[in-house]
Amino acid sequence: LVITPPGPEFVLNISSTFVLTCSGSAPVMWEQMSQVPWQEAAMNQDGTFSSVLTLTNVTGGDTGEYFCVYNNSLGPELSERKRIYIFVPDPTMGFLPMDSEDLFIFVTDVTETTIPCRVTDPQLEVTLHEKKVDIPLHVPYDHQRGFTGTFEDKTYICKTTIGDREVDSDTYYVYSLQVSSINVSVNAVQTVVRQGESITIRCIVMGNDVVNFQWTYPRMKSGRLVEPVTDYLFGVPSRIGSILHIPTAELSDSGTYTCNVSVSVNDHGDEKAINISVIENGYVRLLETLGDVEIAELHRSRTLRVVFEAYPMPSVLWLKDNRTLGDSGAGELVLSTRNMSETRYVSELILVRVKVSEAGYYTMRAFHEDDEVQLSFKLQVNVPVRVLELSESHPANGEQTIRCRGRGMPQPNVTWSTCRDLKRCPRKLSPTPLGNSSKEESQLETNVTFWEEDQEYEVVSTLRLRHVDQPLSVRCMLQNSMGGDSQEVTVVPHSLPFKV
């Protein structure tokens, strides 16, 4: 790249016009403060490219650095950039304006940093002060960049004199961050291995400096050294990795593996550690189990979840009534086992829109060549109560018999109630539950049957009314944890010629 006039620094008169030309072997352009100002690009007769930047009617605000760069940085040979700096002395402008974020300067460790207060005139004398103290600090000043040095956590201002007036800059705030200059990460292919398996630990550091990797590991104690493989990692940003590999682990290889990365031999740098467990045999252990009886509701979906810890990864089987379950094509059943962490797993059986036929005895088995666990439970499918029949009969002895039959799971409870005022019953008058009346008036008999094939209970309750002297509304109500159902019948005395 060639800049004309060559610079590297120009001092322009205010309101003047200035022309800069940059030439190169590929298309070029001018940049100013990461912006691309208006410019004229051209291809020359000799095959070179140029761009002309014309600064017209310049002000102090035009003070700053200008870069000529290749338009499209294709490869390292075109990453070259040329810099020039322009001053436009402007007595009306003190310090060049700063973005508010540039007033906060964060420093890591004890590194040099720059307080970037700049003026438009390179002849001006500029001093740096702690804001609270008026004594100038002895820090080198570069009119193009500002004050560069090592600064404490304080507030600073820059001062200059233009004509006969003293001008102060904005306040700069310096904060030091205690951050290591090296960013190290360590991970292992597996942190749990069986004896005889391999251990592989990877240590990665950001940056492209020449760094020293120092590993410490349990084998070192017995003088058996492992040669790590250290290399750059492909891609950008640049990183360097070191891999420690032990092909055949022993129980004594359990312990802490530390990767220490330093820039120089006497520098502590940064280190990260990881714990490795070498075990004699694999294992499977249940962490979260299910109850002896698990409940599902008819036509609702139900997830049965088992959490276990294992190494190596086990095979998992779910069985129902000792028959192996598999994902159903119809989507009624979904089986999945997934990693929660390196050695922790969750296995789920999802029953979609549960059917009565899915009630039964379930088992989950998790196993590998070293160990196995199993977990069994009964799945109960709860079915809402239905009153299937409410009938009335008149035996010859003058009694009135009302029979109520219903089904549900779990076992329904039966409640009988009566109401004598038919006009107001049941909306305006609560029915009277039976049970308080004397034995002579009514007799109740309830039988319960469990139907194995339907996996639900059937309740048959018979109410015998000895004497009915006026029309009576009788309600049979069945209830379980899934809800309730009821039916009513109106019973009339024998003497009345009709029933309502």
């Epitope: 490869g75 390292p76 990453s79 592989t200 990877r202 990665i204 492209n208 400096d209 020449v210 493989v229 290399d231 750059y232 990692l233 492909f234 891609g235 950008v236 640049s238 990183r239 360097i240 990795g241 891999i243 590999h245 092909p247």
Partner: antibody, heavy 116, light 103 residues
């Protein structure tokens, strides 16, 4: 001894695709960066693609970027280079390499000719 | 990476081949004939594979890597490539090669 054996070269048609495989032996394959370097007739060495051991990160040479894919199978100790949309200028001997910052082992090479 | 296109050395003499423009590490590779497999002579500036004769050595000073062959032999006639990691690209680049002629 460290050996790197390439396969998959031969006569290819422009616009077609190429798949080269390199099998490593005699070393812990999973611990090493692997890659491909090529040499066109009468020319120098040119980096094609690389894949890191530590995190499977990849890099591609400018001439093949966007057309190449490199992958590795540590279980099989193999590294594969897939190169699509072949051009005449892809004609070269392709070498499998071990290493990133410095190459410490080379395969014998497999010749690829792209011609109609 | 910049390296001389050719150098010559007397049989039994010493020759140095330089490479500049790289970063932290240089490697040196010998190729006896075009298309034949290169052989790594030096990696990481000065490390020599166990099967490489001790007459080949590597060093780095500043940003320049140097391959030194002491006691040059007739079979050392070959093209020598330098390689170095390129941070901006994220991979290693190569020099154009130096042809060694043994006189």
């Amino acid at each position: 001894a460290v050996t790197l054996d390439e396969s998959g070269g031969g006569l290819q048609t422009p616009g077609g695709a190429l798949s080269l495989v390199c099998k490593g032996s005699g070393f812990t394959f999973s611990s090493y960066n692997m890659g491909w370097v090529r040499q066109a007739p009468g020319k120098g060495l040119e980096f094609v693609a690389g894949i890191s051991a530590a995190d499977n990160s990849t890099a591609y040479g400018a001439a093949v970027d966007g057309r190449a894919t490199i992958s590795r199978d540590n279980g099989q100790s193999t590294v594969r280079l897939q190169l699509n949309n072949l051009r005449a200028e892809d004609t070269a001997t392709y070498f499998c390499i071990r290493g990133g910052g410095s190459i410490d082992a080379w395969g014998h090479g497999t010749e690829v000719i792209v011609s109609s | 990476l910049t390296q001389p296109s050719s150098v010559s050395a007397n049989l039994g003499g010493t020759v140095k081949i330089t490479c500049s423009g790289g970063g932290s590490y240089y490697g040196w590779y010998q190729q006896k004939s075009p298309g034949s497999a290169p052989v790594t002579l030096i990696y990481y500036n000065d490390k020599r594979p166990s099967d490489i004769p001790s007459r080949f050595s590597g060093s780095k000073s500043g940003s320049t890597g140097t391959l030194t062959i002491t006691g040059v032999q007739a079979e050392d006639e070959a093209v020598y490539f330098c390689g170095a990691w390129d941070n901006s690209a994220g991979y290693a680049g190569f020099g154009a090669g130096t042809t060694l002629t043994v006189l």
